[in-house]
Interface confidence: low
Amino acid sequence: DPVLCFTQYEESSGKCKGLLGGGVSVEDCCLNTAFAYQKRSGGLCQPCRSPRWSLWSTWAPCSVTCSEGSQLRYRRCVGWNGQCSGKVAPGTLEWQLQACEDQQCCPEMGGWSGWGPWEPCSVTCSKGTRTRRRACNHPAPKCGGHCPGQAQESEACDTQQVCPTHGAWATWGPWTPCSASCHGGPHEPKETRSRKCSAPEPSQKPPGKPCPGLAYEQRRCTGLPPCPVAGGWGPWGPVSPCPVTCGLGQTMEQRTCNHPVPQHGGPFCAGDATRTHICNTAVPCPVDGEWDSWGEWSPCIRRNMKSISCQEIPGQQSRGRTCRGRKFDGHRCAGQQQDIRHCYSIQHCPLKGSWSEWSTWGLCMPPCGPNPTRARQRLCTPLLPKYPPTVSMVEGQGEKNVTFWGRPLPRCEELQGQKLVVEEKRPCLHVPACKDPEEEEL
């Protein structure tokens, strides 16, 4: 099926940028792995590079505004022509759910005290308003609550005194039209406007002040424009050469609004000054190699010795990594393929252990399934041997610093009937539903 092809994929937002055009196949669009595509306008944007997990979304709002609730976040497998870790197809969502608490307590309403006395009238003549107030402290609200209703109320009051009314101008009326719309007529154009002393009129008893200034205003019409000329398009110019050496590109034609040029405020040409076409080099773009993550450290050994495990004898170990994905003369991976270090082997060594403190609570599992729970653990942690800071080696090797390697066998006193791990579980509360955020936007 044809897709919309874009020149950029924005990792931070997951959006396609720089529309190249539509009506091309996914395979043609993804000749350049820096490109991205959409199956329909406004649909999910997928980059052409090999699939990998997006960043986790921000945590959704807590499912309740007070007391303990839960919140979700998600990430999506994005890319083309492959799978994300865990053999997951592009477009698939993965969820995490955790406990949350925006506010420990829930708001409680308060009660009003009695009304206070009325304040004086707001005016000294005619009618005004007066106000009285009450306090929200009977009892006081808790945890951000409030009292229902208003803290003050007002009522009309009459001073039994007549107020004088001073005159004020109403707004100016419109200017009368000028006698011509373009400059160069037989008479000098003039425009006039007027206003009334009616907003309000001054009172007679008690006497109010009249409006200051003039009721009429006249002026010459200046700066009338010459009559406008609308612009017109010239012919389309030549098509530009295809600007890329691999994948799809975009060529362009241009035209100029000069046939004629717009004059004296006449409108500019309607329509576009440029138009574009897709050009296809049919050449795949180079793909640079990328290092896989480091492999596991090899077993800690020492040449000419069968085993050094559980002994104060240092050995060596190495790990490697693979340069993957290099195609079409892309760059090779930079850096070393192998890493070497010195080590003490404590593989399968029985060591005295001690119980750790409780870990922090883990995520709610399953995030989208029924009855998710969270857990925390105490682990039997091995006490590593306290070897001296310098270790005497064979002739010519000197004293070496080493890294402990291997999985020891810690021994702890039994705790709640367990020897290695003690776990505590708790249900997650007020769990929201998992919904695809792309479907929510439609």
Epitope: H342, L384, E399, N401
Partner: nanobody, 119 residues
Framework: QVQLVESGGGLRQTGESLRLSCTAS????????MAWYRQAPGKQRELVAE???????TYADSVKGRFTISRDSAKNTVTLQMNSLKSEDTAVYYC?????????????WGQGTQVTVSG
């Protein structure tokens, strides 16, 4: 972290002397061992000389009696005095530092300085 900077490399004739110096910065109070390694073209990197925090030294058989390693804790430097140089001493010489405690260790390397012995 510990940063190491070597100096003093250069070109010498057979039988002449050269003094390499390595200055350490960062968390140098945790360094237990300091050493000089070298790597000739097409060969594995090999230990030349090593000195512990308490002054114990170790030398490769090929340099015993000709090279001397010393450490100045006040200036955070380790030096390698190379006398009676031979053509087989031609290599890139690297300064090395080891941090170590009962929970494990870390190893740090300088960028290297070229020593060429001709004749």
């Amino acid at each position: 972290q510990v940063q190491l900077v070597e100096s003093g490399g250069g070109l010498r004739q057979t039988g002449e002397s050269l003094r390499l110096s390595c200055t350490a910065s960062g968390r140098i109070f945790e360094v237990n061992m300091m050493a000089w390694y070298r790597q000739a073209p097409g060969k594995q990197r090999e230990l030349v000389a090593e000195i512990s925090r308490v002054g114990t030294t170790t030398y490769a058989d090929s340099v015993k009696g000709r090279f001397t390693i010393s450490r100045d804790s006040a200036k955070n430097t380790v030096t390698l005095q190379m006398n009676s140089l031979k053509s087989e001493d031609t290599a890139v010489y690297y300064c090395n530092a080891l941090q170590y405690d009962r929970y494990g260790g870390a190893e740090y390397w300088g960028q290297g300085t070229q020593v060429t012995v001709s004749g």
